[in-house]
Interface confidence: medium
């Protein structure tokens, strides 16, 4: 593992809950630099494996709104604009961190949580199982 | 709007830094029930818009390892296994929440940060610009 030298100016960690409970500054820093710019896109419509976006809202979670992708078809759209069932539309999933209020409704106490979200869909060659 | 009653058992918020700095429980609760993200692990190879996964490691960040997708081709793979440049492979991006050690190297003090990551690639019909 990578050893991190301890900064002498670090906050005190005498708390009996340490290291389970940490201090977090909530003024969010945005690291989305010019090297990775946001691009408004209609990929969800133009993809050969198009998807719909569903709003998932939870006031006890941050981010409170998460958009979930659901593939529109089992197959993929071919050059004629028809669904080709010899190919499969599949969701691309990613595990993300969210903060959940804990205890519920508390404005200044949270717990980290991992959730799996579908970000979009891609078209894949199916795995064909041959029956002996 | 949805009104959230305040929980009487909430932690104290008398700290002069409140509400910028809060306590976060790092015992991560995993809500990924009945899902197996491993199932999607070979999509990057089987997709018509395949991608490579690059490891981005930063010991000052949690999670310290993030995998970034880079599309292998400008075009998409056709039925013959060749790259078709009449279609485009594009990255699907998502903004995610991470924790950054602040001050650096401190084990129990963090700042929230938003970063933009490419999760995978999808094949899209290109936008053709007609010159007048």
């Amino acid at each position: 593992g990578i050893t991190i030298p301890r900064n002498p100016g670090c906050p005190n960690s005498e708390d009996k809950n340490f290291p389970r409970t940490v201090m977090v500054n909530l003024n969010i820093h945005n690291r989305n630099t010019n090297t990775n710019p946001k691009r408004s896109s209609d990929y969800y419509n133009r993809s050969t494996s198009p998807w719909n976006l569903h709003r998932n809202e939870d006031p006890e979670r941050y981010p409170s709104v998460i958009w979930e992708a659901k593939c529109r078809h089992l197959g993929c759209i071919n050059a004629d604009g028809n669904v080709d069932y010899h190919m499969n539309s599949v969701p691309i999933q990613q595990e993300i961190l969210v903060l959940r209020r804990e205890p519920p409704h508390c404005p200044n106490s949270f717990r980290l949580e991992k959730i799996l979200v579908s970000v979009g869909c891609t078209c894949v060659t199916p795995i064909v199982h041959h029956v002996a | 709007g949805i009104t959230i009653p305040r929980n009487p058992g909430c932690p104290n918020s008398e700290d002069k830094n409140f509400p910028r700095t809060v306590m976060v429980n790092l015992n991560i609760h995993n809500r990924n029930t009945n899902t197996n993200p491993k199932r999607s692990s070979d999509y990057y190879n089987r997709s018509t818009s395949p991608w490579n996964l690059h490891r981005n490691e930063d010991p000052e960040r949690y999670p310290s390892v993030i995998w970034e997708a880079k599309c292998r081709h400008l075009g998409c793979i056709n039925a013959d296994g060749n790259v078709d440049y009449h279609m485009n492979s594009v990255p699907i991006q998502q903004e995610i929440l991470v924790l950054r050690r602040e001050p650096p190297h401190c084990p129990n003090s963090f700042r929230l940060e938003k970063i933009l990551v490419s999760v995978g690639c999808t094949c899209v019909t290109p936008i053709v610009h007609h010159v007048a």
């Epitope: 946001k38 976006l53 409170s64 709104v65 958009w67 | 709007g1 903004e95």
Partner: antibody, heavy 126, light 107 residues
């Protein structure tokens, strides 16, 4: 559709403080941010600061740092902007606006101000 | 801070004419630029978000384009109700900044 309703017009003397409210209805208050923007007579729009309502975390424009305080009360779905040490230069219309504050996912966007309050006219005069 | 400059400052236009307003950022802001319309004695209204996306309810005659440092708002076939001041706004980095505005008058 989120609707924002602001408190009424105010007349203040130099040196006094001002506190304007912005009551939100529709949608979940904790899922978006509230920003405050002001407009002096005949002038353009000037961002003063904002709050992430879920946390109560704030960001302020350097120009107003130390003079402005933005808060939010989830129980009443109301945001507040307090400005101290008023001078005649603070005469303006003050607007609150909703910042959707959603995480980017390629299409649904963050940080455009999609709903605005009706504005609160503030006059500072001795 | 990122400075936004708009041109022209003022435009007097005949109905049905095409109007083009430009906004230039002092540094690359990707597509994080939004346009607002403000009619006299009214609150600003979001017209275009992320350089080229139209929120629902905005008439199709309004369109946006550009990325990086140069952006354009176009009104194709101006109507009398479009009179007002148009502002660009960047959300790429704090502090959030607005352009000085372009006033559009109907001849």
């Amino acid at each position: 559709e989120v609707q924002l309703v602001q408190s009424g017009a105010e007349v203040k003397k130099p040196g006094e403080s001002l506190k304007i409210s912005c009551k939100a209805s529709g949608g979940s208050f904790s899922s978006y941010g509230i920003v405050w923007v002001r407009q002096a007579p005949g002038q353009g729009l000037e961002w003063m600061g904002g709050i992430t309502t879920f946390f109560g975390a704030t960001d302020y424009a350097q120009k107003f740092q130390g003079r402005v305080t933005i808060t939010a009360d989830e129980s009443t779905t109301t945001a507040y902007m307090e400005l101290s040490g008023l001078t005649s230069d603070d005469t303006a219309v003050y607007y609150c606006a909703r910042d959707p504050n959603e995480f980017w996912n390629g299409y649904y966007d963050t940080h455009d101000f999609d709903s605005w309050g009706q504005g609160t006219t503030v006059t500072v005069s001795s | 801070e990122i400075v936004l400059t708009q041109s022209p400052d003022f435009q007097s236009v005949t109905p049905k004419e095409k109007v083009t307003i430009t906004c230039r950022a002092s540094q690359n802001i990707g597509e994080e630029l939004h346009w607002y319309q403000q009619k006299p004695d009214q609150s600003p209204k979001l017209l275009i978000k992320y350089a080229s996306s139209s929120p629902s309810g905005v008439p199709s005659r309004f369109s946006g384009s550009g990325s990086g440092t140069d952006f354009t708002l176009t009104i194709n076939g101006l109507e009398a109700e479009d009179a007002g001041t148009y502002y660009c706004h960047q959300s790429f980095s704090l502090p959030v900044t607005f352009g000085p505005g372009t006033k559009v008058d109907i001849k």
